[in-house]
């Protein structure tokens, strides 16, 4: 298996309770515009083929694209929580910015793909959805990295 | 076939100490985060605690933090929980349980058949 | 006190539909993304028979469904059977990183 160096995030990251909860009630709020519920993004289907080993560099690339692709855009929706989500993630990802795989990553990068196409053929229904689970995405990260 | 066993429960006093285990097999233990969840006699499920793939996380019910500690040995495919000033209202069935797949430790698609334990003077 | 709550009982005869809801505090149960549902027999080991809000494990019925609305989450028995009488329970991660369980509900086929 491919080896991961520096795909660690200090466990301090998650003992925040207020933007934990933040994090969560984003999810809700984009949840709740979210109709396409039979779609999920960050499932089985996500992980498939990739050990645990791997994970975290796996959800970097989720949370990159996630931050890039979507949050950005989509910025000025979902107030006040937006805000200060937003900066969270995009320190995790700063913190995350030196975790590499050595070796073929390309069952992940097919994994990723996958999760880019639905957002993008969904379009703007896609990237609610992607925020919906954002909740699935922290937990994921909690999950992996630590 | 994915198989996971409870031992070292049994009958002990208020304010001592048990130390459950779990022997997984059937799957790759390592690849998932692991839970025990408790049911006390003729009651509903109540979830103790649980630890990821590594052991970096590890998350307790307001009930028992502080009196409990879960851990696990990767390389024995093991998971155990340590119950210090254990109380009467401990007294359950204690079930060791797997996620259903390895991204989702809340969905608890696998459950061995459980260990009694009763505190009793 | 559980967290999530569930109705104490529910029936049906056989071939109707019933619902099972489980309402949780936003709080608690964000945005509902790790709901599950559990069917328990006496004196048998809970079965997971829904998990992702709505996806279901290979092997359970395609009679038992999940969905969610706003703080509610709903397991549905259509075309009931005498084996469904059973207990059920939900359950969703919280964002304090524990897992609430409803306090279930006693599915009876009259």
């Known amino acids: 298996a491919p080896i991961s160096s520096h795909c660690r995030l200090d466990k301090s990251n998650f003992q925040q309770p207020y933007i934990t909860n933040r994090t969560f009630m984003l999810a809700k709020e984009a949840s709740l515009a979210d109709n396409n519920t039979d779609v999920r993004l960050i499932g089985e289907k996500l992980f498939h083929g990739v050990s645990m080993s791997e994970r975290c560099y796996l959800m970097k690339q989720v949370l990159n694209f996630t931050l890039e692709e979507v949050l950005f855009p989509q910025s000025d929706r979902f107030q006040p929580y937006m805000q200060e989500v937003v900066p969270f993630l995009a320190r995790l990802s700063n913190r995350l910015s030196t975790c590499h795989i050595e070796g073929d990553d390309l069952h992940i990068q097919r994994n990723v793909q996958k999760l880019k196409d639905t957002v993008k053929k969904l379009g703007e229904s896609g990237e609610i959805k992607a925020i919906g689970e954002l909740d699935l995405l922290f937990m994921s990260l909690r999950n992996a990295c630590i | 076939e994915v198989q996971l066993v409870e031992s070292g429960g049994g009958v002990v006093r208020p304010g001592g100490s048990l130390r459950l285990s779990c022997a997984a097999s059937g799957f790759t233990f390592d690849d998932y985060g692991m839970n025990w969840v408790r049911q006390a006699p003729g009651k509903g499920l109540e979830w103790v605690s649980g630890?990821?793939?590594?052991?970096?996380?590890?998350d307790y019910a307001a009930s028992v933090k502080g009196r409990f500690t879960i851990s696990r040995d990767n390389a024995k495919n093991s998971l155990y929980l340590q119950m210090n000033s254990l109380r009467a209202e401990d007294t359950a069935l204690y079930y060791c349980?797997?996620?259903?797949?390895?991204?989702?430790?809340?969905?608890?698609?696998?459950w061995g058949r459980g260990t009694l334990v009763t505190v009793s003077s | 006190q559980a967290v999530l709550t569930q109705p104490s009982s529910v029936s049906g005869s056989p071939g109707q539909s019933v619902t099972i809801s489980c309402t949780g505090a936003?709080?608690?149960?964000?945005?509902?993304?790790?709901v599950s549902w559990y069917q328990q027999h006496p004196g048998k080991t809970p079965k997971l028979i829904i998990y992702d809000v709505n996806k279901r494990p290979s092997g359970v019925s395609n009679r038992f469904s999940g969905s969610k609305s706003g703080n509610t989450a709903s397991l549905t028995i259509s075309r009931l059977q005498a084996e469904d009488e059973s207990d059920y329970y939900c359950?969703?991660?919280?964002?304090?990183?524990?897992?609430?369980f409803g306090g279930g509900t006693k599915v009876t086929v009259l």
């Open positions: 349980a797997r996620g259903w797949y390895s991204g989702s430790p809340w969905s608890l698609g696998h």
């Open positions: 359950s969703s991660y919280t964002s304090r990183y524990t897992t609430e």
């Open positions: 936003s709080g608690d149960v964000g945005a509902y993304n790790f």
């Open positions: 630890v990821n793939w590594n052991g970096g996380t590890r």
